[in-house]
């Protein structure tokens, strides 16, 4: 099967790597602009330079390309707790994450929120907090995860998944109580 | 057919309170995360707050926080949006939605689901 070629793509595919075709002209192939760069002007005639200026302060291009226009530079999501790991430069877009301690929950593809990585308190760390997953924890006898959090057996209730994790917990006090008696 | 359909909305006084409900069907509700979204008279749409799929991550508008609480019952398959210490300017229709889709950067939301809304008017 054939892949489904845009317009551009087709256009695009006629001339080397490197080179776009003309828009007016389909017998002039133009050299395309380096990142960092739009095109200005496209080149008038085989050849001939293609007229690139420099993105402006807010925009950037990161790979070669014959776009009119920079592309606007992103802005890190403080409401998501995103912070600045680099700023926007004429070639390379924003870089926003997380900080140290924090890993990243995606509500879509591209848009994500910082959260804290948990300390697995009342267990022991199985797996270290990456940058797009939380701490998985291991809980000490007594107690069961919810939420990723260790709570104590005390707190389970009988419809709770937890009656498994804790169920030896229960037994031994019921067999306490039970040898107590005789 | 995905179908979610809101109730609780209704008038309340400044300073009260509501619980808002959504009940989904048409989808493995347990599998999805689920948003709020809000439009009040006159504006744009605002995305009010978000749950995962399995309730342990929570995200709240500025303009909501530490007053509304998102939740659901994945037994139920229902989600819930729990309004205290109501303004004025809470007054909007509220929207449960699914399927939520971000531009490159996520400036722009869009959903692909929506429930029918209900309206919640906070008024003396």
């Known amino acids: 099967l054939v892949p489904h070629l845009g317009d551009r793509e087709k256009r695009d595919s006629v001339c080397p790597q490197g080179k776009y075709i003309h828009p007016q002209n389909n017998s002039i192939c133009c050299t395309k602009c380096h990142k960092g760069t739009y095109l200005y002007n496209d080149c008038p005639g085989p050849g001939q330079d293609t007229d690139c200026r420099e993105c402006e302060s807010g925009s950037f291009t990161a790979s070669e390309n014959h776009l009119r226009h920079c592309l606007s530079c992103s802005k890190c999501r403080k409401e998501m707790g995103q912070v600045e790991i680099s700023s926007c430069t004429v070639d390379r877009d924003t870089v926003c994450g997380c900080r140290k301690n924090q890993y990243r929950h995606y509500w879509s593809e591209n848009l994500f929120q910082c959260f804290n990585c948990s300390l697995c308190l009342n267990g022991t760390v199985h797996l270290s907090c990456q940058e797009k997953q939380n701490t998985v924890c291991t809980c000490h006898a007594g107690f069961f995860l919810r939420e990723n959090e260790c709570v104590s057996c005390s707190n389970c209730k009988k419809s709770l998944e937890c009656t498994k994790l804790c169920l030896p917990q229960i037994e031994n006090v019921k067999g306490t109580e039970d040898s107590g008696t005789t | 057919e995905v179908q979610l359909l809101e109730s609780g909305g209704g008038l309340v006084q400044p300073g009260g309170s509501l619980r808002l409900s959504c009940a989904a069907s048409?989808?493995?509700?347990?599998?999805?995360?689920m948003y709020w979204v809000r439009q009040a008279p006159g504006k744009g749409l605002e995305w009010v707050s978000a749950?995962?799929?399995?309730?342990?991550?929570?995200y709240y508008a500025d303009s909501v926080k530490g007053r509304f609480t998102i939740s659901r019952d994945n037994s139920k398959n229902t989600l819930y949006l729990q309004m205290n210490s109501l303004r004025a300017e809470d007054t909007a229709v509220y929207y449960c939605?699914?399927?939520?889709?971000?531009?490159?950067?996520?400036?722009?939301?869009?959903?692909?689901?929506w429930g029918q809304g209900t309206l919640v008017t906070v008024s003396s």
């Open positions: 939605a699914e399927g939520l889709q971000t531009s490159d950067h996520g400036e722009r939301i869009s959903f692909d689901y």
């Open positions: 048409g989808f493995t509700f347990s599998g999805y995360n």
């Open positions: 749950i995962d799929a399995y309730g342990t991550h929570t």
